[in-house]
């Protein structure tokens, strides 16, 4: 039994890191393998993650971690019984994939303005709480070409757009994702999408 693709890990910079790897053949990850991990820190202890299958030869492990700080470094040991298959390390702050924003809501009761709000996925004491920026994706269910991205570079988790920038009388969907420039993170997954019917009063045209 050998590791074909070494484990790569990403952290949500809060409490979970996800590691994925591939073996050289079909493997029952949960019964044959264990991933041991430990924070390099005087008051830490070793933990064991039981991996799950991720395709025939693929394995994935969800590591429960202490609240992350930038200096953290974890040792990783992949075992098959008594055999050490791979040894490595992982700095969560260098491989961050933020959590997805939640509670995306479209408020249509403001006159001819759409207000989109969502929740920051981090608690206020987390470093990323004040460092997330967002991308909002809005698209028409009727017209695949009507697809747009709004970059929200301020901290407030909201976006205002004129209803008239979208077509009237049709349904739209929106979703939002996050990233943090300070740690050069990847983008989060998209939030669940929300749907609304766009309608607004057409301005009276004078001839």
């Amino acid at each position: 039994m050998k590791v074909l693709q070494e484990p790569t890990c990403v952290s949500d910079y809060m409490s979970i890191s996800t590691c994925e790897w591939k073996m050289n053949g079909p493997t029952n990850c949960s019964t044959e393998l264990r991933l041991l991990y430990q924070l390099v820190f005087l008051l830490s202890e070793a933990h064991t993650c039981i991996p799950e299958n991720n395709g025939g030869a693929g394995c994935v492990c969800h590591l429960l971690m202490d609240d992350v700080v930038s200096a953290d470094n974890y040792t990783l040991d992949l075992w098959a019984g008594q055999q050490l298959l791979w040894k490595g390390s992982f700095k969560p702050s260098e491989h961050v994939k933020p959590r997805a924003p939640g509670n995306l809501t479209v408020h249509t009761n403001v006159s001819d303005t759409l207000l989109l709000t969502w929740s920051n996925p981090y608690p206020p004491d987390n470093y990323l709480y004040n460092h997330l920026t967002y991308a909002v994706n809005i698209w028409s269910e009727n017209d695949p070409a009507d697809f747009r991205i709004y970059n929200v570079t301020y901290l407030e988790p909201s976006l205002r757009i004129a209803a008239s920038t979208l077509k009237s009388g049709i349904s739209y969907r929106a979703r939002v994702r996050a990233w943090a420039q300070c740690y050069n993170t990847t983008w989060s997954e998209w939030s669940p999408s929300t749907k609304w019917h766009n309608s607004y009063r057409e301005p009276f045209e004078q001839h």
Epitope: S15, V40, F41, L42, L43, S44, E45, M65, D66, D67, V69, S70, A71, D72, P123, P124, D125
Partner: antibody, heavy 115, light 109 residues
């Protein structure tokens, strides 16, 4: 808002015992290492003890064998049991959250050791 | 055990002036594990700088940290009245634990 609220200080005779408490709120207590740091009157800061999320502990040489740090994650609380107290243990004791450094501190509680 | 020595013991300056505080370690310290705190009379210490140069949440940008190895510096670019206090450096060592410098008092001249 992260808060650490301390209780349990007071006057004790040399050789006596005292238990300090620290209640945390506004953060996930169970995922953070916790510490005690003290400051003798007119002196600097001295790290006393720390406890990891899994219960691993460490102590300064000056208190080893006399002080015991513990935590109750269900109550979001940190404790310091101080036995065989000496005059040199007299100080303001702070609880703190942190790891390699201490990012949030309690308000401090005064422990007076005097006959 | 790593010993941190801060200098000067006392710094007498006027508001608006620049303050430069030094922290010297008896052996090399990882920059990741070096922090600075501010303490005012009757108050708990407050984290200013971690990782030698990163400002903690809510700390004004007039505070900056620098250095590596055995020599570290805290700089306050323009002293405000509320900056007069005692400042401590602190390091974490994987064997000896956490140690503080003896402190530098910044007082009004």
């Amino acid at each position: 808002e992260v808060q650490l609220v301390q209780s349990g200080g007071g006057l004790v005779h040399p050789g006596g015992s005292l238990r300090l408490s620290c209640a945390g709120s506004g953060f996930t207590f169970s995922r953070n290492a916790m510490f005690w740091v003290r400051q003798a009157p007119g002196k600097g800061l001295e790290w006393v003890s720390g406890i990891g999320t899994g219960g691993a502990t460490n102590y300064a040489d000056s208190v080893k064998g006399r002080f015991t740090i513990s935590r109750d994650n269900a109550k979001n609380s940190l404790y310091l049991q101080m036995n065989s107290l000496r005059a040199e243990d007299m100080a303001v004791y702070y609880c703190a959250r942190g790891r390699y450094y201490f990012d949030y501190w309690g308000q401090g509680t005064l422990v007076t050791v005097s006959s | 055990e790593i010993v941190l020595t801060q200098s000067p013991g006392t710094l007498s300056l006027s508001p608006g002036e620049r303050a430069t505080l030094s922290c010297r370690a008896s052996q090399s310290v990882s920059s990741s594990y070096l922090a600075w705190y501010q303490q005012k009379p009757g108050q708990a210490p407050r984290l200013l700088i971690f990782g030698a140069s990163s400002r903690a949440t809510g700390i004004p940008d007039r505070f900056s940290g620098s250095g590596s190895g055995t020599d570290f510096t805290l700089t306050i670019s323009r002293l405000e009245p509320e900056d007069f206090a005692v400042y401590y450096c602190q390091q974490y060592g994987s064997s000896a634990g956490w140690t503080f410098g003896q402190g530098t008092k910044v007082e009004i001249k």
